[in-house]
């Protein structure tokens, strides 16, 4: 089936926005005014995954770029990366597992759990201007809660 997608931005629970930091990395920092235009717009695609009544599988691509967030092992540690794909073949309903995140809504906040690495989440640091990463703890120092803002196509 044709994949259903929507455009959105994400902010962590401390209201930090996500921006590009070099060609293959995202960082989180507070933005205001015109600087808000720097934040990345995601194309969130609703894909096949181990869907449950409270987890919705999605893929997170960067709008109008052939880049997707993916989860891989680097030095034996689950790691978040931006991966380049062939735009002719993506997005698709049946994404490879490394591209899939379980979107979990709790108390109007969103978590994004890696399908490839259960209990690992898209995370940001408390500190400003630090990379977005895959974290293996919830409820600690690092932030795993986000809000989503819809962006018109």
């Amino acid at each position: 089936a044709p994949v259903r997608s929507l455009n959105c931005t994400l902010r962590d629970s401390q209201q930090k926005s996500l921006v590009m930091s070099g060609p293959y990395e995202l960082k989180a920092l507070h933005l205001q005014g015109q600087d808000m235009e720097q934040q990345v717009v995601f194309s969130m695609s609703f894909v096949q995954g181990e869907e449950s009544n409270d987890k919705i599988p999605v893929a997170l691509g960067l709008k109008e770029k052939n880049l997707y967030l993916s989860c891989v092992l680097k030095d034996d540690k689950p790691t978040l990366q931006l991966e380049s794909v062939d735009p002719k073949n993506y997005p698709k309903k049946k994404m490879e597992k490394r591209f899939v995140f379980n979107k979990i809504e709790i108390n109007n906040k969103l978590e994004f759990e890696s399908a490839q690495f259960p209990n690992w989440y898209i995370s940001t640091s408390q500190a400003e201007n630090m990379p977005v990463f895959l974290g293996g703890t919830k409820g600690g120092q690092d932030i795993t809660d986000f809000t989503m803002q819809f962006v018109s196509s």
């Epitope: 089936a1 181990e50 449950s52 049946k94 490879e96 259960p118």
Partner: antibody, heavy 122, light 107 residues
Framework: EVQLQESGPGLVKPSETLSLTCTVS????????VSWIRQPPGKGLEWLGL???????YYNSPLKSRLTISKDNSKSQVSLKLSSVTAADTAVYYC????????????????WGQGTLVTVSS | DTQVTQSPSSLSASVGDRVTITCITS??????MNWYQQKPGKPPKLLIS???TLRPGVPSRFSSSGSGTDFTFTISSLQPEDFATYYC?????????FGQGTKLEIK
């Protein structure tokens, strides 16, 4: 060889809880999802829900409030509990293995148990 | 939820006949349609999985075609052991949904 076998009481009283067990062999429950399906006598197939390898569950909306699916990977068993049953829950209940092939066929079901008839009657 | 409409609900045919069953879905499911055969007192048996893929050991007289919303299941030359009930199942999205079934009887 992949096998699934349903077991449980054949008779349940109205308003009680129907409990069934699916014992599997030939594959690991931590790697593959298992669905439950039922078929009332002389009627078609209804998909009830599933439990994934990681333990997450998806329940079909009409039964969501009454249905619980759980599993014990070490015993290779998946269980179904359906509460507050009525005569309309009389059916043959099947468990089936999900193909769980990421990026290809995640939701299809390939192997089924023989089924067990559950009658709801006082 | 994706609704699946299967037709006909019953069908009388003779050995050697060519038989066709159709399933129409309420949403585009790409090629994610599966076809099962069920005999009385037995569980459904998967004949054709998504992508119109014949399962190992299933005779080549069984075939399917279609994508999107319109799907066809064909038995090219009916054999005595083919008289059974056939179901389609969409596996594109949850909840999984079956067609209502087609009972194939001897004419």
């Amino acid at each position: 060889e992949v096998q699934l076998q349903e077991s449980g009481p054949g008779l349940v009283k109205p308003s009680e809880t129907l409990s069934l067990t699916c014992t599997v062999s030939g594959f690991s429950l931590s790697d593959y999802g298992v669905s439950w399906i039922r078929q009332p006598p002389g009627k078609g197939l209804e998909w009830l829900g599933l439990i994934w390898g990681g333990g997450d569950t998806y329940y079909n909306s009409p039964l969501k409030s009454r249905l619980t699916i759980s599993k014990d990977n070490s015993k290779s068993q998946v269980s179904l509990k359906l509460s507050s049953v009525t005569a309309a829950d009389t059916a043959v209940y099947y468990c089936a293995k999900q193909r769980t092939l990421w990026g290809y066929d995640l939701y299809g079901m390939d192997y089924w148990g023989q089924g067990t008839l559950v009658t709801v009657s006082s | 939820d994706t609704q699946v409409t299967q037709s006909p609900s019953s069908l009388s045919a003779s050995v050697g006949d060519r038989v066709t069953i159709t399933c129409i879905t309420s949403t585009d499911i790409d090629v994610d349609m599966n076809w099962y055969q069920q005999k009385p007192g037995k569980p459904p048996k998967l004949l054709i999985s998504q992508g119109n893929t014949l399962r190992p050991g299933v005779p080549s007289r069984f075939s399917s075609s279609g994508s999107g919303t319109d799907f066809t299941f064909t038995i090219s030359s009916l054999q005595p052991e083919d008289f059974a009930t056939y179901y389609c199942l969409q596996s594109d999205n949850l909840p999984l949904t079956f067609g209502q079934g087609t009972k194939l009887e001897i004419k």
